[in-house]
């Protein structure tokens, strides 16, 4: 799902009140609800009858710095028999997300938002057939 | 997929720095990649095996303001048929996410960052049974 | 210990609908379906459907489908059947019962039940 | 839909005796499900994936059957054992049970 454009309005002071200095606002160290969780489990990437691998990838100046992203295994789905069934598609699941990166310069470090798409899982689907004339 | 804490060595200054003044840390406006979008197929909702409907929660004082869940539609999976499978189940892909909570008094405004568990879609699968005595 | 504590008998009129609950205990809610089941005077069970609060999935035999109306509230971990358009045809005992997760056991594999709600339909 | 139609419809059994019921499938399932229903409560689980016994369940049941052929034996009856029991499947959309066994003491 999208994450829409922030224009220049949320991050601003209201009208009446003096503008931020230097383009830059106060972020609040910790985070709200931390401790919840996915209760995904049992390895359903494996189980899914359009499976996925993960892959995890590394950046120490980004928070979180684990973004793990999904790839569909086949691109038929599987069927009961545990084969592909080559006339449905496996099909990736993308949200956007945001995370956080860290800028320094020196003792002089500051924090900025990024958007990331991350591929969730997959999901079995009947392919739309475009007879073309 | 699940964001790991934070613990307190992210948002700080290296050890040879002063301390973030008052638990706060400096947030650039603006957002990485802010054009980046998803590219899913059509209608994967309702075309999957495993479909699903979408239900918007709106807080202006959140970035992004509009999530997006997803809940999945049927408890089993449609087969090719366009009935429901009760020997497979839908179960929802569910990813944690990091949204920004605006709080203000009078002109003082800060922001901090929450960590909110979407789900994204649903996928068919089997069942593991394993039955505890 | 899993408990299911549904709520009381009901007597109501023809046409009328009623809402009958289902709450929970000794297990994690939100993880595992609740299927609602019809018994008319002692006689066969019939399924009338499911619903999974994390998934949001819901499943309805076809034969109940502008009867029963199955919902969740996972703040007070209570599931509920409304039935409406009320009949003679409806005078029975209700039982919600919990099935699966979904990811260990199937959702339709049903294993504890509640105690029954009785409903009589007469003017 | 899938009927499972259960038989007898009523059966007696003395205890210590053998006691066999049987469930008939209109359609292949997987696997057969039992619940064991006594008067003025509800049903409990019973036999589940076929063959496998709920917990608490004493071992002189048992169950067996695949396709469209399955049944609930109990090797020596015993008092406690006189109740209804059902047959359910949930291999076919809508999940179905049996009309019951009423199983008596003489």
């Known amino acids: 799902r999208k994450i829409p454009k922030v224009g220049h309005t949320f991050f601003q002071k209201p009208e009446s009140c003096p503008p931020v200095p230097g383009g830059s606002m106060k972020l609040d160290i910790g985070i709200i609800n931390e401790n919840q969780r996915v209760s995904m489990s049992a390895n359903i990437e494996s189980r899914s009858t359009s499976p996925w691998n993960y892959t995890v990838t590394w950046d120490p100046n980004r928070y979180p710095s684990e973004v793990v992203q999904a790839q569909c295994r086949n691109l038929g789905c599987i069927n009961a028999q545990g084969k592909e069934d080559i006339s449905m598609n496996s099909v990736p699941i993308q949200q956007e997300t945001l995370v956080v990166r860290r800028k320094h310069q020196g003792c002089s470090v500051s924090f900025q938002l990024e958007k990331v798409l991350v591929t969730v899982g997959c999901t079995c689907v009947t392919p739309v057939i475009h007879h073309v004339q | 997929r699940k964001i790991p804490k934070v613990g307190h060595t992210f948002f700080q200054k290296p050890e040879s720095c002063p301390p973030v003044p008052g638990g706060s840390m400096k947030l650039d406006i603006g957002i990485i990649n802010e054009n980046q979008r998803v590219s899913m197929s059509a209608n994967i909702e309702s075309r999957s095996t495993s479909p699903w409907n979408y239900t918007v929660t709106w807080d202006p004082n959140r970035y992004p303001s509009e999530v997006v869940q997803a809940q999945c539609r049927n408890l089993g999976c449609i087969n090719a048929q366009g009935k429901e499978d009760i020997s497979m189940n839908s179960v929802p892909i569910q990813q944690e996410t990091l949204v920004v909570r605006r709080k203000h008094q009078g002109c003082s405004v800060s922001f901090q960052l929450e960590k909110v568990l979407v789900t994204v879609g649903c996928t068919c699968v089997t069942p593991v049974i394993h039955h505890v005595q | 210990e899993v408990q299911l504590q549904q709520s009381g008998p009901e007597l109501v009129k023809p046409g009328a609908s009623v809402k009958i609950s289902c709450k929970t205990s000794?297990?994690?809610?939100?993880?595992?379906?609740m299927h609602w089941v019809k018994q008319s005077h002692g006689k066969r069970l019939e399924w009338i459907g499911g619903?999974?609060?994390?998934?949001?999935?819901?499943s309805y035999n076809q034969n109940f489908k502008g009867k029963a109306t199955l919902t969740v509230d996972k703040s007070s971990s209570t599931a509920s059947m409304e039935l409406r358009s009320l009949t003679s045809e409806d005078s029975a005992v209700f039982y919600c019962?919990?099935?699966?997760?979904?990811?260990?056991?199937?959702?339709?594999?049903?294993?504890?039940w509640g105690q029954g709600t009785s409903v009589t339909v007469s003017s | 839909q899938i009927v499972l139609t259960q038989s007898p419809a009523i059966m007696s059994a003395s205890p210590g005796e053998k006691v066999t019921m049987s469930c008939s499938a209109s359609?292949?399932?997987?696997?057969m499900h039992w619940f064991q229903q006594k008067s003025g409560t509800s049903p409990k689980r019973w036999i589940y994936?076929?063959?496998k016994l709920a917990s608490g369940v004493p071992a002189r049941f048992s169950g067996s059957g695949s396709g469209t052929s399955y049944s609930l034996t109990i090797t020596d009856m015993e008092a406690e054992d006189a109740a209804t029991y059902y047959c359910?499947?949930?291999?076919?959309?809508?999940?179905?049970f049996g009309a019951g066994t009423k199983l008596e003491l003489i």
């Open positions: 019962a919990r099935g699966g997760d979904g990811y260990y056991t199937n959702y339709f594999d049903i294993d504890y």
């Open positions: 000794g297990y994690t809610f939100n993880e595992y379906t």
């Open positions: 994936d076929t063959s």
């Open positions: 619903i999974n609060p994390n998934s949001g999935g819901v």
């Open positions: 359910q499947q949930w291999n076919s959309h809508p999940l179905t």
């Open positions: 359609s292949s399932v997987n696997y």
